[in-house]
């Protein structure tokens, strides 16, 4: 039997307002509203918390019966829909201990785990997975790309008691591995030996000058020489013009700086590699994954352009149940959501085309009127008379 610690689908109208608490840390936090957005698969089932004000911080949270994930799997799952074509904003959740003062939740409030998508400018389109380990927020060393389209997506984090993890988007694995390998929770296993230093006679030169090579005697020639073909101009007056000097040209026999040929260095020892030793600071921690207390799920975000919808929150200890729940919620409505969006896009295209056609028609009409105004006035005669008068149309 799976343990379901928290589940929120917003299926009871305004009932969510009694379960979710707004932070009062700042007076100008943005407001969440219940909405299924501009397009959806099922208007009722797809209702979720939507950010509604641009360029705002948001801080909202819901509490649940506190639990510890020691000795068991932890699964955190929710859906996010950036229907506003987001430019910069968070779509992540934070799991806090139950000691959090929900009315004072803010960006620096200490959390246990932060997970979910974050988009900001062209440089950030990633899924954050951050663990608070011994009081420090430790970021994952891998880059997990998030979805940046306008549709609803399902995000799942699985943390197992064997210190492994998995991240899924739309019920498909996008990343997995070991907590110790993919985060810097622990000091490195090996460090450079602080007592070792490169011996003074260590030769890192692969090539050296050939000591037997010597410069040829005829090597040194000047770079520039007087032009042998130059002649003093006939009108040159040494009293007036000074002593005539021929112009200088590049010496064809100039060989440049002589360098001895290079040979393999018989004393070459290669690049000195600093020897490593076991790090005395390192000790394994089999309980990296474990937290004594989870009690609050919070949305602590900044959004430049609002419109993101959060729905189908689930915290459980059962991976299969979470996958099933995802398929029964996001999985059921995703196709219809895309259909509705495609239909809206098609209607918009048609409307745009119609507007363009109307504009073109108006422009043609205006042009005709202008032409009539511009052309010279003609006498009002019948066609027959005009023809008899010999008029011809230009």
């Amino acid at each position: 039997e799976p343990a379901v610690y928290f589940k929120e689908q917003f299926l009871d109208g305004d009932g969510w307002t009694s379960r979710w608490i707004e932070s009062k840390h700042k007076s100008d936090f943005g407001k969440f509203v219940l909405s299924s957005g501009k397009f959806y698969g099922d208007e009722e089932k797809d209702k979720g918390l939507q950010t509604s004000q641009d360029a705002r911080f948001y801080a909202l949270s819901a509490s649940f019966e506190p639990f510890s994930n020691k000795g068991q799997t932890l699964v955190v799952q929710f859906t996010v829909k950036h229907e506003q074509n987001i430019d910069c904003g968070g779509g992540y959740v934070k799991l806090f201990p139950n000691s959090l003062d929900q009315t004072d939740m803010h960006g620096d409030s200490e959390y246990n785990i932060m997970f979910g998508p974050d988009i900001c400018g062209p440089g950030t389109k990633k899924v954050h997975v951050i663990f608070n380990y011994k009081g420090k927020n430790v970021l994952i060393n891998k880059d997990i790309r998030c979805k940046d389209d306008e549709f609803t997506h399902l995000y799942t984090l699985i943390v197992r008691p064997d210190n492994t993890y998995e991240v899924k988007i739309d019920n498909s694995q996008v990343e997995s591995g070991s907590l110790e390998d993919d985060w810097d929770f622990l000091p490195p296993k090996k460090i450079k030996d602080p007592d070792a230093s490169k011996p003074e006679d260590w030769d890192e030169r692969a090539k050296i000058d050939d000591p037997t090579d010597s410069k040829p005697e005829d090597w040194d020639k000047p770079e520039h020489i007087p032009d042998p073909d130059a002649k003093k101009p006939e009108d040159w007056d040494e009293e007036m013009d000074g002593e005539w000097e021929p112009p200088v040209i590049q010496n064809p026999e100039y060989k440049g700086e002589w360098k001895p040929r290079q040979i393999d260095n018989p004393d070459y020892k290669g690049t000195w590699i600093h020897p490593e030793i076991d790090n005395p600071e390192y000790s394994p921690d089999p309980s990296i994954y474990a937290y004594d207390n989870f009690g609050v799920l919070g949305l602590d975000l900044w959004q430049v352009k609002s419109g993101t919808i959060f729905d189908n929150f689930l915290i459980t200890n059962d991976e299969a149940y979470a996958e099933e729940f995802g398929n029964e919620t996001w999985g059921v409505t995703k196709a219809a959501e895309k259909q509705m969006k495609d239909k809206q896009d098609e209607e918009q295209r048609t409307r745009r085309m119609m507007r363009t056609k109307m504009r073109m028609r108006r422009m043609r009409r205006t042009r005709r009127k202008m032409r009539r105004k511009m052309s010279p006035a003609r006498p009002r005669t019948s066609c027959r008379e005009a023809c008899l008068q010999g008029w011809t149309e230009a």
């Epitope: 910069c88 900001c120 400018g121 062209p122 950030t124 954050h128 420090k136 970021l139 490195p188």
Partner: antibody, heavy 127, light 106 residues
């Protein structure tokens, strides 16, 4: 990689204001946060505040609150720092520095340090 | 307000290991960055997030952070490493720098 070029040296009278500019090139301006750091002669580094151009909001060190204004113009990829009510203690080299923006939260870029710095602008306050 | 404390100066013989410390209350819970500054020049980031090296920074620079002390280690110190070094962290919604340490290579 982004490069930051700052405006030239300034000599100011006590009580006046100074506005230093920092133009970014070679990168997407909206992908960075810009901090302003000053260094008085023979002293250490002191953070004054910063701005994330894509947010449009600035964050200031308590010490400079009310006296410093940091702005950014995305169209010209330029950040500005204006310091008012100048006194002789404000004589310093003023640096702008950028941090890669790796997320939408204010604190995100501070996880990555300031990896590109301007050449510095010397501001001398003297009567 | 949060404070970071560095020794004013550290001396090291060429080829030896230099260690510069940065003390702060529970600094191990924060992300610490280190900057190198040579006379008349702008600072250069040499370590970020406690122990990560930006591209172009030699391998001899490393960092660690736990408890109340963060440490910048320069192994096989060279004459060119002589400079001022500053630690930096994010504390109480503000950026905080240490007072700086002058590293002298003997």
């Amino acid at each position: 990689e982004v490069q930051l070029v700052q405006s030239g040296a300034e000599v100011k009278k006590p009580g006046s204001s100074v506005k230093v500019s920092c133009k970014a090139s070679g990168g997407t301006f909206s992908s960075y946060a810009i901090s302003w750091v000053r260094q008085a002669p023979g002293q250490g580094l002191e953070w004054m505040g910063g701005i994330i151009p894509i947010f449009g909001t600035a964050n200031y060190a308590q010490k400079f609150q009310g006296r410093v204004t940091i702005t950014a113009d995305e169209s010209t990829s330029t950040a500005y720092m204006e310091l008012s009510s100048l006194r002789s203690e404000d004589t310093a080299v003023y640096y702008c520095a950028s941090s890669p923006l790796r997320g939408s939260g204010w604190y995100w870029h501070y996880y990555y340090g300031m990896d590109v710095w301007g050449q510095g602008t010397t501001v001398t306050v003297s009567s | 307000s949060y404070e970071l404390t560095q020794p004013p100066s550290v001396s090291v013989a060429p080829g030896k290991t230099a260690r510069i410390t940065c003390g702060g209350n529970k600094i191990g819970t924060k992300s610490v960055h280190w900057y190198q500054q040579k006379p008349g020049q702008a600072p250069v980031l040499v370590i970020y997030q406690d122990s990560k090296r930006p591209s172009g920074i030699p391998e001899r620079f490393s960092g660690s952070n736990s408890g109340n002390t963060a440490t910048l280690t320069i192994s096989g110190t060279q004459a060119m490493d002589e400079a001022d070094y500053y630690c930096q962290a994010w504390g109480s919604s503000t950026v905080v720098f240490g007072g700086g340490t002058k590293l002298t290579v003997l």
